[in-house]
């Protein structure tokens, strides 16, 4: 029986010689479970596994804990790859996280974290980040130290409010914190003064809702 090649992430895909951006099947670490992911093979040398994308408001991001755990949407468009896969992957080796942002005026910016991982579900997929560089603010718009993940049905934030219900979307909310890339999608000319929009405070401030976002990860040693 011919042995099937499995890919753990998009860096594996790239190293195998498949260097065209697109959707590839990835396998969970130490498992046969599979997931489909969009691989960006062009940005900064390629090998990036896309874990989130917002671009047109076509997908509802006000989802349950289980949906954020397993992922939703279409990897070629708006989607969330899934906390469980990302957690398992980023605990195998060191990963970097790149967040690419676009505003409605045609400007682009990014934040790059030199070390990123998510705790297991037992610890509510808490985010861990180190070493920020980039053009989307000198201060991290993801609260440091990292917070637990919250969704509309799992209130793990540090507010006497319920951040996920109020701001919409699942995120690593503080009280409620300087970012939420899974907030409500607002079209152009309706995207200001919106506290529940797609926010990256240290680039665009409190009420500005972004046009497009991508979150992607890659092994630090790629």
């Amino acid at each position: 029986k011919e042995e099937q090649i499995t890919f753990r992430d998009c860096a594996d895909v790239f190293r195998s010689g498949l260097t065209t951006s697109g959707i590839y099947t990835l396998t969970f670490p130490n498992s046969t479970e599979e997931t489909k992911a969009y691989c960006d093979m062009e940005t900064g040398g390629g090998g990036w596994t896309t874990i989130q994308r917002r671009e047109d408001g076509s997908v509802d991001f006000q989802r349950t804990w289980k949906e954020y755990k397993v992922g939703f949407g279409n990897p070629s468009g708006e989607h969330w790859l899934g906390n469980e896969f990302v957690s398992q992957l980023t605990n195998q080796q060191r990963y970097v996280l790149k967040i690419h942002l676009r505003d409605w005026e045609g400007n682009e910016a990014y934040s790059l974290y030199e070390h990123f991982y998510l705790s297991s579900e037992e610890f509510n997929y808490r985010i861990h980040l180190k070493g920020l560089t980039g053009t989307a603010g000198k201060i991290s718009s993801i609260s440091q130290p990292g917070n637990d993940f919250s969704t509309k049905d799992a209130d793990n934030d540090k507010c006497i409010c319920k951040c996920s219900q109020m701001l919409t979307g699942g995120w690593w909310f503080d009280a409620c914190g300087p970012s939420n890339l899974n907030g409500m999608y607002y079209p152009q000319r309706q995207n200001t003064n919106k506290f529940n929009g797609i926010k990256w405070y240290y680039w665009k401030g409190s009420g500005y809702s972004l046009k497009a976002t991508t979150m992607m990860i890659r092994p630090a040693d790629f």
Epitope: M166, A175, C176, G177, K194, G207
Partner: antibody, heavy 122, light 112 residues
Framework: EVQLVQSGGGVVQPGRSLRLSCAAS????????MHWVRQAPGKGLEWVSY????????YYADSVKGRFTISRDNAKNSLYLQMNSLRAEDTAVYYC???????????????WGQGTLVTVSS | DIVMTQSPLSLPVTPGEPASISCRSS???????????LDWYLQKPGQSPQLLIY???NRASGVPDRFSGSGSGTDFTLKISRVEAEDVGVYYC?????????FGQGTKLEIK
């Protein structure tokens, strides 16, 4: 535990000045907008002033504009209200209050100080 | 400025019975983001006000579920399903949609 501890109240003559302080602890003070709200004896609540997390945005009620100055020192986790040209109608309990949400999202007051009484009388 | 009108101004209630307070605004409080910036506060005797309900209908953490807020636009209601002795005090609605923020006159809830 979030705490807002106020000081600086007292009895003052009309036309004189007073400075109120509000010392914050238990949260990242520099991330929150802060307010002063007052309550005249036996009356309801009246919003007085607001300052954004960085201090770059400031608003006042018409009744105190030009006489009161709100400020903050994020290094000291402290909020202030400088009250000049005080009038009898400024007599009230003054409360400092913290925005419910951080990063200058104005959705109500999640925490309040204990209040400090300012009495303006000759 | 937006005028907030509460009724009744005095509310005597028997413990275990429901209570309802109305709050009307002189202009709509519905923001373009779909939220009503309307909060409810309780000021117990000798204490500072405390947040009960934010954005019209969201209960703050630690607030008993017998408290509920509803309404949109100009008409809002705070309901207490079963009043308890510890609920006595003055209840205020406050709007934050239009600057400056303004409070209602307050409703004094007392036990019969």
């Amino acid at each position: 535990e979030v705490q807002l501890v106020q000081s600086g109240g007292g009895v003052v003559q009309p036309g004189r000045s007073l400075r109120l302080s509000c010392a914050a602890s238990g949260f990242t003070f520099s991330s929150y907008g802060m307010h002063w709200v007052r309550q005249a004896p036996g009356k309801g609540l009246e919003w007085v002033s607001y300052i954004s997390s960085s201090g770059s945005t400031i608003y006042y009620a018409d009744s105190v504009k030009g006489r009161f100055t709100i400020s903050r020192d994020n290094a000291k986790n402290s909020l202030y209200l400088q009250m000049n040209s005080l009038r009898a109608e400024d007599t009230a309990v003054y409360y400092c209050a913290r925005d419910l949400l951080d990063y200058d999202i104005l959705t109500g007051y999640g925490y309040w100080g204990q209040g400090t009484l300012v009495t303006v009388s000759s | 400025d937006i005028v907030m009108t509460q009724s009744p101004l005095s509310l005597p209630v028997t413990p275990g019975e429901p209570a309802s307070i109305s709050c009307r605004s002189s202009q709509s409080l519905l923001h373009s983001n779909g939220y009503n910036y309307l909060d409810w506060y309780l000021q117990k005797p000798g204490q500072s006000p405390q947040l009960l309900i934010y954005l019209g209908s969201n209960r703050a953490s630690g607030v008993p579920d017998r408290f509920s807020g509803s309404g949109s636009g100009t008409d809002f209601t705070l309901k207490i399903s079963r009043v308890e002795a510890e609920d006595v005090g003055v209840y205020y609605c406050m709007q934050g949609t239009h600057w400056p923020p303004t409070f209602g006159q307050g409703t004094k809830l007392e036990i019969k």
